[in-house]
């Protein structure tokens, strides 16, 4: 058993049929010695008396808010949560496996630049009685500070018969060094509590590996005289790190016909313009990627050819 | 470059960008199912990293690029020695057209651009890393290539910025 926060405790249980459970001793936080009784949740049934209560925790029915009283007055509370371990593996019932970029990806994180700011998000089908708490650091043995805000519900989607809820959190490294080569990864830890179930999820990454620039901005077409060709131009997204002579991007320009089956013409360039042939009913799209490190491409910015 | 002269920024920019391309073709991370099995532990704590105080940021380069260039040179020599060591030359053998050979040559080429014959910056000793099992050697190769990708990305940014703002 360990303390998650004041008066909230997590009991770690091996979860299998007829498992013996864990013996837990609760102590009433009071100078009083006599006349103390214990109850669980809203029930008035007295579970025991005395300054300490010993219970065998085996299942969710044994978890909850234990309260010690004296003469009708509440002395203190202890909330017991359960953390299940099945076949040697901690349960992951609360969050959905996003399976990208690999299996067992419950937390996904992205950064728009090298400033040390990043966003993480996760999915769940649970709509109520759900709380999250996020902590982060750079490195684990001698951790350096990363400050995370509160997790918020950022999107709701309908998937078949189920509703899916997306939560996200923004974090900022306290002393970020955008130009340095990272040697210690960022660690993100999310505590999830649903009713009386506790779970924790972690992710470890280098900012360089989660970079995904915003799409290029101000995408414009300029027809070239007496030609089917057009000059496409664009600019670096506002959110990308500066100076651009140092934090450079590379770009992919794509001409795509109306039909998905039509052949796509692609050009790769380090410049912020390119000359392409604009076909009727086609569209031109441009996306960006770090020029020197193969992290994610941005989403496409698009304009119609006509 | 030792003694404060300016490097051939444009040449260094071109060669460092080529290094980036080669490092990624030697270990294309994207979508490889074995990545999660590489483990999170560092390849080696002795790999030289370009750190915050090494003056490789735009302001540091403007003030005095020598500190940063020396750091990059140390790293290039370190990785050049690693790629030439029995970690890469022993079994399992690489295919003749492996990008590792070109990568090794390009590391040497860029380090010579930074330090012409007759000049000497102190270099870092390479640790004796070679594991006994072939699979351990193979895994170590991929981990070295991953850290090299990060190193050459920073070096390429430095030379691109230098070529754009510090070239005579």
């Amino acid at each position: 058993i360990w303390e998650l926060k004041k008066d909230v405790y997590v009991v770690e249980l091996d979860w299998y049929p007829d498992a013996p459970g864990e013996m837990v001793v609760l102590t009433c936080d009071t100078p009083e010695e006599d006349g103390i009784t214990w109850t669980l949740d809203q029930s008035s049934e007295v579970l025991g008396s005395g300054k300490t209560l010993t219970i065998q925790v085996k299942e969710f029915g044994d978890a909850g808010q234990y309260t010690c009283h004296k003469g009708g007055e509440v002395l203190s509370h202890s909330l017991l949560l359960l953390h299940k371990k099945e076949d040697g593996i901690w349960s992951t019932d609360i969050l959905k496996d996003q399976k990208e970029p690999k299996n067992k990806t419950f937390l996904r994180c992205e950064a728009k630049n090298y400033s040390g700011r990043f966003t993480c998000w996760w999915l769940t089908t649970i709509s109520t009685d759900l709380t999250f708490s996020v902590k982060s650091s750079r490195g684990s043995s001698d951790p350096q500070g990363v400050t995370c805000g509160a997790a918020t519900l950022s999107a709701e989607r309908v998937r078949g018969d189920n509703k899916e809820y997306e939560y996200s959190v923004e974090c900022q490294e306290d002393s970020a060094c955008p130009a340095a080569e990272e040697s210690l990864p960022i660690e993100v830890m999310v505590d999830a509590v649903h009713k009386l179930k506790y779970e924790n999820y972690t992710s470890s990454f280098f900012i360089r590996d989660i970079i995904k620039p915003d799409p290029p901005k101000n995408l414009q077409l300029k027809p070239l005289k007496n030609s089917r060709q057009v000059e496409v131009s664009w600019e670096y997204p506002d959110t990308w790190s500066t100076p651009h002579s140092y934090f450079s991007l590379t770009f992919c320009v794509q001409v795509q016909g109306k039909s998905k089956r039509e052949k796509k013409d692609r050009v790769f360039t380090d410049k912020t313009s390119a000359t392409v042939i604009c076909r009727k009913n086609a569209s031109i799209s441009v996306r960006a990627q770090d020029r020197y490190y193969s992290s994610s491409w941005s989403e496409w910015a698009s304009v119609p050819c006509s | 470059v030792p003694g404060g002269s300016s490097p051939a920024w444009t040449q260094c920019q071109q060669l460092s960008q080529k290094l980036c391309t080669l490092a990624w073709s030697a270990h294309p991370l994207v979508g490889h199912m074995d990545l999660r099995e590489e483990g999170d532990e560092e390849t080696t704590n002795d790999v030289p990293h370009i750190q915050c105080g090494d003056g490789c940021d735009p302001q540091g380069l403007r003030d005095n690029s020598q500190f940063c260039l020396q750091r990059i040179h140390q790293g290039l020599i370190f990785y050049e020695k690693l790629l030439g060591s029995d970690i890469f030359t022993g079994e399992p053998s690489l295919l003749p057209d492996s990008p590792v050979g070109q990568l090794h040559a390009s590391l040497l080429g860029l380090s010579q651009l930074l330090q012409p014959e007759g000049h000497h910056w102190e270099t870092q000793q390479i640790p004796s890393l070679s594991p006994s099992q072939p699979w351990q050697r193979l895994l170590l190769r991929f981990k070295i290539l991953r850290s090299l990708q990060a190193f050459v990305a920073v070096a390429a940014r430095v030379f691109a910025h230098g070529a754009a703002t510090l070239s005579p």
Epitope: - | S25, A26, M33, D34, E38, S98
Partner: antibody
Framework: QVQLQQSDAELVKPGASVKISCKVS????????IHWMKQRPEQGLEWIGY????????KFNEKFKGKATLTADKSSSTAYMQLNSLTSEDSAVYFC???????????WGQGTSVAVSS | DIVLTQSPASLAVSLGQRATISCRAS??????????IHWYQQKPGQPPKFLIY???NLDSGVPARFSGSGSGTDFTLNIHPVEEEDAATYYC?????????FGGGTKLEIK
């Protein structure tokens, strides 16, 4: 030295399920994936799938999805494969093997024979 | 899925002669300087025994009369000079992507 010790032969009825074990020793269980193969009499080898004991997550050959369940118990350094809804087509010898990253299956279990018969 | 086609299905070789087994992949299994093809030997009633990894590298303890070669889609296992104890079925296997697949096997008989 590295060893993979599989459980004994099984004779099971059609429609039943069977759970085969593969106990490893001589290396850190969580370091390498454990793969499972099927071999029918006088036939070649088929790859069923693997489990990575460090995260407990399996990957399957599409053909065996729903047929095989892969688990790993870190405390006993044992990998398990459960085969469900058995038919005569599942009668075979099943092998477990370890695979270091980027490498081959370098150590194999001795095999477990499963016979499905009424 | 990558299909591995082994040929011949069986062959008989005189003691001391060369045995050559071919393994052809339906698409390239080479990338980043390596060919992700491995070879195994299996004798009746036994599990497969690991012989060669990444197309051409011998596992420790495997006799030097075994050798592997090839890249891209065409691979070869050679045994020279063949000995009595080499009578077995030989399988190639790829680990380029999921799902892994094995070749159909080549049964080697010693004359």
């Amino acid at each position: 030295q590295v060893q993979l010790q599989q459980s004994d032969a099984e004779l099971v009825k059609p429609g039943a399920s069977v759970k085969i074990s593969c106990k490893v020793s001589g290396y850190t269980f969580t370091d390498h994936t454990i793969h499972w193969m099927k071999q029918r009499p006088e036939q070649g080898l088929e790859w069923i799938g693997y489990i990575y004991p460090r995260d407990g997550y399996p990957k399957f050959n599409e053909k065996f999805k729903g047929k095989a369940t892969l688990t790993a118990d870190k405390s006993s350094s044992t990998a398990y494969m459960q085969l469900n809804s058995l038919t005569s087509e599942d009668s075979a010898v099943y092998f477990c093997a370890r695979r270091p990253p980027y490498y081959a299956m370098d150590y194999w279990g001795q095999g477990t024979s499963v016979a499905v018969s009424s | 899925d990558i299909v591995l086609t082994q040929s011949p299905a069986s062959l008989a070789v005189s003691l001391g002669q060369r045995a050559t087994i071919s393994c052809r992949a339906s698409k390239s299994v080479s990338t980043s300087g390596y060919s992700y093809i491995h070879w195994y030997q299996q004798k009746p009633g036994q599990p497969p025994k690991f012989l060669i990894y990444l197309a051409s590298n011998l596992d420790s303890g495997v006799p030097a009369r075994f050798s592997g070669s090839g890249s891209g889609t065409d691979f070869t296992l050679n045994i020279h000079p063949v000995e009595e104890e080499d009578a077995a079925t030989y399988y190639c296997q790829h680990s380029r992507e999921l799902p892994y697949t094995f070749g159909g096997g080549t049964k080697l008989e010693i004359k």
